[in-house]
Each structure stands twice: as C-alpha cells, then as structure tokens.
C-alpha cells in the first residue's frame, strides 16, 4: 500500500532561541496524526519505500503580550524541510519557506503561518526533518503546524 | 475513479463583518471549478467516498482604498479548514493559516494570501467547509479564493 | 506512467524591474529538478498527457540591504500560474498569491515565501507558465524558487 | 566586550522626577536589548524595565507601568530610564543590563542578562 505520514507537533519539547533547530517532537499516532508505510523515529520521517513522494509542512508562529517580552520586533520566522541520506551522509534543503515580521508592541497579539510543498524522488532509508527559526513562537495547534509526505508513484 | 473537487468563491454572496464566518457560496462546475464523485451542498464538501484525502485552500485578501476605509489597520487575516461528522456531530479544523496584518493608510492598495494543505482520513458522510475571517476583504477571483481534495488511496 | 514535473529556477537569467513578468528559466534535470511525460520548452511546462494534475509553486523573494537601494518600500510581491491554450490561442491565470510588504530601510535583510497549489484539468498541449512581480528580488536557490506537477488520475 | 556606565541617580522627594542615563561601548549597540534593575538593601535584584535593539518594544514591572520610560538613542549608543511619580519604595541601586543572548523571547531573569553597569544610587525621601 502506497506510504503516508501526518505528523503534528508535540509542544511539549520545543526548544528556545531564535537560531534555526530541527525539531525532533512529533505526533504519528493521535489526532490528525498518522503514518503507514513510513517510520518515524528520533525526531525524523525515515522513507521505507522507494517512490516519488509529495511533501508538505504548514508551520503557524504566534505571540501574545502574555507570553512574555520579545527580544527583538524583527524577527525572521523559517521553515526547511530536509533530507538526510545515511548511506552518503549529507542533509539538503528541499523546500523553504517564510517571511521577515516586524511584531511591534503595538499589537498585542501577531500571527503568521508558513506552506511549502513539492515533489521530490525519496529512497528507502533517507529521511525527512523539519527545521525552523524561534522554535518558542510556534503554534503547539495540530492543526497548525504539521508537516507530511504521500507517495504518488514509483521510480521507473 | 478517485473522487475530487476544486471550489472556488461565488463572490455574490460574502458575509460582511471581520469576525469568523463559514463560506458557503462556492462554485462547483465553471471556470476552474469541478467536482467528481464528492458532493457539494449547503456550502459544505460532503466526502460520499472512504479514503487518504489531500485537502487544501488558498485564500486571498484584498483591500483598496476606494472600497472605503478598513475599521481597524490591525487585521487577523485567517483560514480555518474543518470537517464536520454528522453520525456524531462534531466539528474539528483540520488546518488553520494566515497571518496578523498592519494595512495602514500610507499604502492605497494590500494584499495577502494563505494557502493550507495536508492529508487526511475522510470517511463517506463527513463534510469539509471553509472558515475567513475578515470575509468582505476576500478576493473574488476564481484564480484567488478556492478550496479543494483529492482522493489519494484507500483506507486499508 | 504517471507524468510530473519539478522545475527549480534558473537564476542565470533572471529579468529586472518591478513589473510582472514570466519566469523564463528553470532547470529541469538537476539537483531536486527532474520531468517525466511532461516537456520543458521556452520556458512553459507543456503537458503530454491529459489529466487532472496537482500543480504547486512555491516563490521566495528576499534583499539585503548590501544588494542596494529598494526603488520602493512598498513592494507588492506576487505569483501567477497560468495555462495557455496552444489550439484557441488563450492565457489563463489557475492560481495566484502573494502579499504586498513594506520592506523598510530598518531591517538589514527581509525575506518573503509564496505558496499556491490546486486541482486542474490538463489536456495535451496546453501550457504551464509562472509570473512573478519583482523577479529581481527572487531567492536563486533550488529549496526556494520552484513550480511542478503531477497527474492523480485521468478525465473520465 | 561591553562596558555600561550609568549616571543620573541622586536623592528626590517623594511624587518627584530622575533620568538615569546608560552609556554603552563596545559591539553593536543597536543589535541587542537593554534592560534596567533595581536591587534595594537586602533584597533581591529586581526586573524594572527592559527595551529592544530598535527601540520599538518596550516591557515593565508591574510596580513601575505608567510611571517610568525606558528609551533608547541608538546614535548615541545610550539607554534611559525617565523615572516620574517617585515613591519611597523606588529607593534602590539602579543598574542597566545587556541582553546578548540570541533568545526569541528577552527574560526579566537578571542571570539571563550578560553585561552589566557599576549601578547608580537612587534615594526617594518621604
């Protein structure tokens, strides 16, 4: 049967600062999460079957005047969907996606959600990683920030 | 054959008002719009088939300034994506986007687009609709504002 | 076998100014790029195989201020996907986004992303074209600038 | 290496004004947030107010909202504290912070804080 994976956010282990960092907690098995001829494992989607897969992330950054003081209204808020290949060990960028903000103190609450997706050759053992910027600003919704993968095809 | 439908906005009939509304007026069979083997009815995309669904929306907003003058220059520009189960009456969101927005005076003419996507267990009977806030600011074009799925694979 | 497309941009070629022009240049057979039962000619995406296909774009803009003086900080940065009818000579734009942004002379460096993605019937022929406003500004990289397709399913 | 040196403190009567001023040195001023404290006899350093590189945000302690103003002159590479409606319990030594950690969010922890000034003595007669 073709491979799938949803996985959504496990808020309970997101990192602080605002250097981008690979974000290795995430729901398979709850929720809108999911996973069927895939393996998720230390924080990666690992492909187990060759294919032509579509990937997607949809990454949601927030902040409220309640959660504390942001160190800086300039903030660059990122998402990189890479893929790692353990036989050749080296990690690339697929995809990327966001945006400079500016979230002054005039506006007590600030939103903003990042979509990449594409279509991308995977082979067995190579695995998918999501890395984004201020980790602490995102949404911990799982409907919010989610990333996933389905195959469509096989290689010729 | 695999069912799908791509909606896209019937203009003639947004809501006014900046708070959440559900869009119910889509186009199903012009322009760009289609739909096979799903059902579109009371603004709702009724899944008459088991299945992995890809679900996805993009969303414009648009405002100028001879449309007359924004309430507020601080928007919530949102897309809330939800699915509704009648056997039990629920209703979840599947995928939330967008962004919070300074449309200030300086400028004659704002933009912003969302787009949401992600794959989803939908079961025959459950009903896919689409939530904005701020829906007098929607952009009417069919190529803008839309919605839509396809069938990926079966529920094993 | 199922025909797809993944067209990374081709930055050697990129034209100037601030007006919406068609992206021209794009790999089709390095790096992430690659086609199959799909043609890249003259700078469109020519479809081989009737079809409903998924089509994507993903679109980044970025500048730093080492790059030089914006012309102006209101920008309004935008993405087309168009079909052109070869048999009734027609262009049509499927999808669009974009945001416009106040890129000020405060932050070193600002950046933006785009993404658009939607269900469309193709026939042979026809022809995928992307356009973009402020192509000057676009991200060079392959993770970053992209469009593709792939066919789910035939017309019935 | 950063090097703060504040000026401005004194003795002021109750319901009166002081400006405490922050001179910094060193890398990029603009870059980095700035924060002041206070820390009374034989209590502990306490959290007053802090401001972002830009100057574009500004956070208070509850106990000073609405009467104190912490701004920032990024050309002159200095950082204010406008202290009005002073009350005896303000008496403290007042000391300004360099925030140079790369956190999203600034904390009002003053062991987060990575640069500090000698403090300047503030007195608030009754």
């Known amino acids: 049967a073709q491979p799938f994976a949803h996985l959504t956010i496990n808020a309970t282990n997101i990192p602080t600062g605002s250097h981008k960092v690979s974000l290795s907690s995430w729901y398979h098995d709850r929720g809108w999460a999911k996973i069927s001829n895939m393996t998720f494992s230390n924080g990666k989607l690992i492909v187990n079957q060759d294919g032509f897969y579509y990937l997607y992330a949809n990454i949601c950054f927030r902040h409220h005047e309640t959660s504390g003081d942001l160190a800086t209204e300039y903030l660059q808020l990122m998402v990189y969907v890479t893929k790692t290949s353990i036989k050749i060990p080296s990690s690339h960028t697929l995809m990327k996606g966001g945006s400079t903000k500016y979230w002054s103190g005039n506006s007590e609450f600030h939103f903003y959600s990042i979509n990449v997706g594409g279509f991308f050759k995977l082979r067995s053992g190579e695995e998918i990683s999501v890395e984004v910027s201020n980790p602490s600003l995102l949404d911990p919704d799982q409907d919010a920030t989610y990333f996933g993968a389905f195959k469509v095809r096989d290689i010729d | 054959a695999q069912p799908f439908a791509h909606l896209t906005i019937n203009a003639t009939n947004i809501p006014t008002g900046s708070h959440k509304v559900s869009l119910s007026s889509w186009y199903h069979d012009r322009g760009w719009a289609k739909i096979s083997n799903m059902t579109f009815s009371n603004g709702k995309l009724i899944v008459n088939q088991d299945g992995f669904y890809y679900l996805y929306a993009n969303i414009c907003f648009r405002h100028h300034e001879t449309s007359g003058d924004l309430a507020t220059e601080y928007l919530q520009l949102m897309v809330y994506v939800t699915k509704t189960s009648i056997k039990i009456p629920s209703s979840h969101t599947l995928m939330k986007g967008g962004s919070t927005k300074y449309w200030s005076g300086n400028s004659e003419f704002h933009f912003y687009s969302i787009n949401v996507g992600g794959f989803f267990k939908l079961r025959s009977g459950e009903e896919i609709s689409v939530e904005v806030s701020n829906p007098s600011l929607l952009d009417p074009d069919q190529d803008a504002t839309y919605f839509g799925a396809f069938k990926v694979r079966d529920i094993d | 076998a199922q025909p797809f497309a993944h067209l990374t941009i081709n930055a050697t070629n990129i034209p100037t100014g601030s007006h919406k022009v068609s992206l021209s240049s794009w790999y089709h057979d390095r790096g992430w790029a690659k086609i199959s039962n799909m043609t890249f000619s003259n700078g469109k995406l020519i479809v081989n195989q009737d079809g409903f296909y998924y089509l994507y774009a993903n679109i980044c803009f970025r500048h730093h201020e080492t790059s030089g003086d914006l012309a102006t900080e209101y920008l309004q940065l935008m993405v087309y996907v168009t079909k052109t009818s070869i048999k009734i000579p027609s262009s049509h734009t499927l999808m669009k986004g974009g945001s416009t942004k106040y890129w000020s002379g405060n932050s070193e460096f600002h950046f933006y992303s785009i993404n658009v993605g939607g269900f469309f019937k193709l026939r042979s022929g026809e022809e995928i074209s992307v356009e973009v406003s402020n192509p000057s500004l676009l991200d060079p990289d392959q993770d970053a600038t992209y469009f593709g397709a792939f066919k789910v399913r035939d017309i019935d | 290496e950063v090097q703060l040196v504040e000026s401005g403190g004194g003795l002021v009567q109750a319901g009166g004004s002081l400006r405490l001023s922050c001179a910094a040195s060193?890398?990029?001023?603009?870059?980095?947030?700035m924060g002041w404290f206070r820390q009374a006899p034989g209590k502990e350093r306490e959290f007053v107010a802090s401001i972002t590189g830009s100057g574009g945000s500004t956070y208070y302690a509850d106990s000073v909202k609405g009467r104190f103003t912490i701004s920032r002159d990024n050309a002159k590479n200095t950082v204010y504290l406008q202290m009005n409606s002073l009350r005896p319990e303000d008496t403290a030594v007042y000391s300004c912070?360099?925030?140079?950690?790369?956190?999203?969010?600034?904390?009002?922890?003053?062991?987060?804080?990575?640069?500090w000034g000698q403090g300047t003595q503030v007195t608030v007669s009754s």
């Open positions: 912070a360099a925030y140079i950690r790369p956190d999203t969010y600034l904390s009002r922890d003053y062991r987060k804080y990575d640069y």
């Open positions: 060193g890398r990029t001023f603009r870059s980095y947030p």
